[in-house]
Amino acid sequence: QRLPRMQEDSPLGGGSSGEDDPLGEEDLPSEEDSPREEDPPGEEDLPGEEDLPGEEDLPEVKPKSEEEGSLKLEDLPTVEAPGDPQEPQNNAHRDKEGDDQSHWRYGGDPPWPRVSPACAGRFQSPVDIRPQLAAFCPALRPLELLGFQLPPLPELRLRNNGHSVQLTLPPGLEMALGPGREYRALQLHLHWGAAGRPGSEHTVEGHRFPAEIHVVHLSTAFARVDEALGRPGGLAVLAAFLEEGPEENSAYEQLLSRLEEIAEEGSETQVPGLDISALLPSDFSRYFQYEGSLTTPPCAQGVIWTVFNQTVMLSAKQLHTLSDTLWGPGDSRLQLNFRATQPLNGRVIEASFPAGVDSSPRAAEPVQLNSCLAAGD
């Protein structure tokens, strides 16, 4: 299915991972301001804060040399984010391994800005993407991924960190957003909802998808995550929406089939290496991009977000497994682990394709309202 108001003929097309719908070439909301810790009442963003295990628990901070005390995302201070007052958030919260500053959760006290002031910044994530307002940037070339097809051995760590399920990635996964914009993948994690309630972090024209995958990367210009936090382009996240499709997604099944083993908060297991790229849409050329933040404390800004236009398809059973298997702290299910969308505050979302053209049945004469700011970057 397509995003709301997506062109019926938009070139979505299923991808290698069984994806099928591209984001409806819509525009990201072009305003994102101080992060709202709670979803505005009535909004679909049930939980009011982001959870980005991978973002907050950035995996090995220093992918280069694992011997050096690289900082892990999970070592970053985490905060409890107040959630939508109307949505009983799942209190998913985790004591970051004894870290005093690691208390935060979706929906509830303390407010995230109290845990990390950056969570009140003006350029936060996630945001609502409105394709019609996106600036088409021909300079945004297809993403390049190298080394993402991992062999079964060595195995990878899959962990329930209390606010998401996170897969720690080994050294060697390289990603380029463009010439001179090179990154190394650190970890990936997911955000989801609950029965009958979608749980993606980003939205498209207000439409929230069932779930969302985030693959967190560290710029090769930095050796450690803590050095990159808050630095423009220091971190980059590839995000893709997960939707319901008719068939089982075999790539995702390699992870979803193991969730029962890590149902308890803080538990982990090992899974065979897999083709990480198969978890993403097959079309690396059509995406939206903007500068935002981690969606969970510490909410550091300067993060380059790349949101695929094409979505990934999972079966209804798989989406149910994702949202109904894990437990967070306090005997509460780990669900609705997404942060409310944040104001763009003047930011312009760029698109690697003409997303605002013929993307909405309601727009008789689509007009590109914003111009590309990063041509040639």
Partner: antibody
Framework: QVQLVQSGGGLVQPGRSLRLSCTAS????????MHWVRQAPGKGLEWVGF??????????QYSASVKGRFTISRDDSKTIAYLQMNSLKTEDTAVYYC???????????????WGQGTLVTVSS | DIQMTQSPSSLSASVGDRVTITCHVS??????LSWYQQKPGKAPKLLIY???NLHTGVPSRFSGSGSGTDFTFTISSLQPEDIATYYC?????????FGQGTKLEIK
């Protein structure tokens, strides 16, 4: 030379227990994951499970057919892998093979060294 | 679980013949497939790993190819001692699964 020598098979009644042992020699036992594979009379091969090495936390992995009933363990000091089989069923009757597979330097699970096999017959 | 389908389930060939066995996998396993030979009353022996790599000490008449979901095992010139049952096995993810086997006989 590299070899795996098995012991412990035999006839056992349904519902009872039995433990198989596999003694390794000729290679660095601690580097490898150790698996168990079985073969029912006249049938094909079925993977039972494995136990990881110390570097990977000694955690086991089992097939659905034996999970909760069988336990795989190892004693690195003696270079022995064990398969503890409880609540045995007649359908567990098979030749059980101890197998080496999954070295830190390999990139997937292939079974390059097999024990001679030991017959386990579950019958009343 | 990943399903492995071998074909044929049995075959008869003459000494010197070229013999081919195929293995179809229910999902993409890249090249993480192995082939084993098992003679009556004996433990299986690894012949081919990673779809096409010949295991140490295995005669060069044995070979393997393929990737993704379709794989082929070939004996370029059948020898009397090759009479056995051959199995394919996926090493992509657990539970590890084997094909049902192909019993090879001499005409």
């Amino acid at each position: 030379q590299v070899q795996l020598v098995q012991s412990g098979g035999g006839l056992v009644q349904p519902g009872r227990s039995l433990r198989l042992s596999c003694t390794a020699s000729g290679f660095t036992f601690t580097d490898y994951y150790m698996h168990w594979v079985r073969q029912a009379p006249g049938k094909g091969l079925e993977w039972v499970g494995f136990i990881r090495n110390k570097a990977s936390g000694y955690t086991p992995q089992y097939s659905a057919s034996v999970k909760g009933r069988f336990t795989i363990s190892r004693d690195d000091s003696k270079t022995i892998a064990y398969l503890q089989m409880n609540s045995l069923k007649t359908e567990d009757t098979a030749v059980y093979y101890c197998v080496r597979g999954g070295h830190a330097g390999s990139n997937y699970w292939y079974f390059d060294v097999w024990g001679q096999g030991t017959l386990v017959t579950v019958s009343s | 679980d990943i399903q492995m389908t071998q074909s044929p389930s049995s075959l008869s060939a003459s000494v010197g013949d070229r013999v081919t066995i195929t293995c179809h996998v229910s999902q993409n396993i890249n090249v993480w497939l192995s082939w084993y030979q098992q003679k009556p009353g004996k433990a299986p022996k690894l012949l081919i790993y990673q779809a096409s790599n010949l295991h140490t000490g295995v005669p060069s008449r044995f070979s393997g190819s393929g990737s993704g979901t379709d794989f082929t095992f070939t004996i370029s010139s059948l020898q009397p001692e090759d009479i056995a049952t051959y199995y394919c096995q996926q090493g992509q993810s657990y539970p590890f699964t084997f094909g049902q086997g192909t019993k090879l006989e001499i005409k």
